[in-house]
């Protein structure tokens, strides 16, 4: 693995245990909870990160839905089942045999059912809308400077290919970052937009997943960009299947 050989740590994931027990005595880092070896040169999958994160309160509410099919992570934390690639298994169940289907970012996309519930495939989340509200500043940020800074952040910190950052919208104090990545566009080695969005979300909350790095210090032309509210909407390649009861609630 590419974990730092001298002190055997994982720069991209502090929720690992690293040991010189890889082939030839090389450093190998395994995700907490799952025990899966991770590639420390890139982001760890959200499923493995959620599995590693035993518990913590997580709040997400829907204020405005950008589309009738957009999903918001209202269920918060759970201990997911990950496949051997580290992706979410399409069907997730809790200890009481309540099951539901999830998308590729682990967000529930069906009503809850029992063990007979079938989830035939893991549906890909191809469009993520990150909706941020920044704290009051002396004046509005310059849109093009803000756009450039956020694109740089996703490229350099999260290693997300620039083509997957579809747009950055700004109407003070609201910033919207659109990430788009279809199955056909994602090549081997490309960071998944769901993983990048999760790392960003944790950074924004002051819970960085990076080892030993300082927290996220976002600045636009030297002016601090402090986020006071984050909402993330997920759009799947196939619309979710909820009962009418939920849709009208």
């Amino acid at each position: 693995h590419t974990a730092a050989q001298d002190n055997c740590t994982c720069p991209t994931n502090k929720m690992t245990v690293c040991s010189p027990d890889g082939p030839g005595g090389r450093c190998q880092c395994r995700a907490l909870g799952s025990g899966m070896a991770v590639d420390c040169s890139t982001l760890t999958s959200k499923c493995l990160l959620l599995k590693a994160r035993m518990s913590a309160p997580k709040n997400a509410r829907t204020l405005v839905r950008p589309s009738e099919h957009a999903l918001v992570d209202n269920d918060g934390l759970y201990d997911p089942d990950c496949d051997p690639e580290g992706r979410f298994k399409a069907r997730q169940c809790n200890q009481t045999s309540v099951c539901w289907c999830v998308n590729s970012v682990g967000v529930r996309r069906t009503d809850k059912g029992d063990l007979s519930l079938r989830c035939d495939e893991l549906v890909r989340t191809h469009h993520i809308l990150i909706d941020l509200r920044h704290r009051p500043t002396a004046g509005a940020f310059n849109h093009s400077d803000l756009d450039a800074e956020l694109r740089r952040l996703f490229r350099e910190r999260y290693r997300l290919h620039p083509k997957f950052v579809a747009a950055v919208h700004y109407e003070q104090p609201t910033i919207q970052i659109e990430l788009r990545q279809n199955t056909s566009q994602k090549a081997a080695g490309d960071v998944d937009i769901g993983d990048a969005a999760y790392y960003f979300e944790r950074d924004i909350k002051g819970e960085s997943l990076f080892q030993g790095r300082g927290g996220l210090d976002l600045r636009v032309r030297g002016e601090p960009l402090q986020v006071e509210r984050t909402l993330i909407y997920y759009l799947d390649e196939i619309p979710p299947k909820f009962s009418m009861k939920r849709l009208t609630a």
Epitope: V17, P20, L32, A37, D83, P84
Partner: antibody
Framework: QVQLVQSGPEVVKPGASVKISCKAS????????LGWVKQAPGQGLEWIGN????????NYNEKFKGKATLTADTSTSTAYMELSSLRSEDTAVYFC?????????WGQGTLLTVSS | DIVMTQSPDSLAVSAGERVTMNCKSS????????????LAWYQQKPGQPPKLLIY???TRESGVPDRFSGSGSGTDFTLTISSVQAEDVAVYYC?????????FGQGTKLEIK
């Protein structure tokens, strides 16, 4: 050289508890995972769980949760496994092993016999 | 949990013969991050702890005779002994250490005719 030396055989009564030790030498105890494996008479191998002594991270096979408790004492480079509420089906040889791709190091095994 | 299934359960061969035994896992053991298969083969003789023969599906542990070789990827793996010796009589186990809980196959017992 790397060595894992386990405590001697135990004969205990049903319902009792027992604590098996595994003393490590020849390597840095705190930076390798140490696992425990059960082998019932004439049977195959079952992974019980593991511990990372440097940070006391512990993982259990769901089957052994509530049965086995793993601990480690870094000052003596010794790992322990306590087995509780013992029953006849807990009769087995228990091995400790240093885990990892290059870790072919096992203790000699501790035979636990549960008998009234 | 990943289920490991070995075949055959037992086999008897003459000294000098080539022998292969198989191990099938219920899920892929190939880690896409490092392209390594998390599959090991162990040899266990009566009254002894298991001895590591092969790790990473195909890498021979140091000190293991070169008549032992491992192959396969994903879900299907094979241990081959090119020329069986009398001292190879043992039970052979495959093990996955890809994701918790680590699991072993039920074992293949090798005997000499």
């Amino acid at each position: 050289q790397v060595q894992l030396v386990q405590s001697g055989p135990e004969v205990v009564k049903p319902g009792a508890s027992v604590k098996i030790s595994c003393k490590a030498s020849g390597y840095t105890f705190t930076i390798y995972w140490l696992g425990w494996v059960k082998q019932a008479p004439g049977q195959g191998l079952e992974w019980i769980g593991n511990i990372f002594p440097g940070s006391a991270y512990i993982n259990y096979n769901e089957k052994f949760k509530g049965k086995a408790t793993l601990t480690a004492d870094t000052s003596t480079s010794t790992a322990y496994m306590e087995l509780s509420s013992l029953r006849s089906e807990d009769t087995a040889v228990y091995f400790c092993a240093r885990e990892g791709s290059n870790s072919g190091y096992w203790g000699q095994g501790t035979l636990l016999t549960v008998s009234s | 949990d990943i289920v490991m299934t070995q075949s055959p359960d037992s086999l008897a061969v003459s000294a000098g013969e080539r022998v292969t035994m198989n191990c099938k896992s219920s899920q892929s053991l190939l880690n896409s991050g490092n392209q390594q298969n998390y599959l090991a083969w162990y040899q266990q003789k009566p009254g002894q702890p298991p001895k590591l023969l092969i790790y990473g599906a195909s890498t021979r542990e140091s000190g293991v005779p070169d008549r032992f070789s491992g192959s396969g990827s994903g879900t299907d793996f094979t241990l081959t002994i090119s020329s069986v010796q009398a001292e190879d009589v043992a039970v052979y186990y495959c093990q996955s250490d890809h994701i918790y809980p680590y699991t072993f196959g039920q074992g293949t017992k090798l005997e000499i005719k």
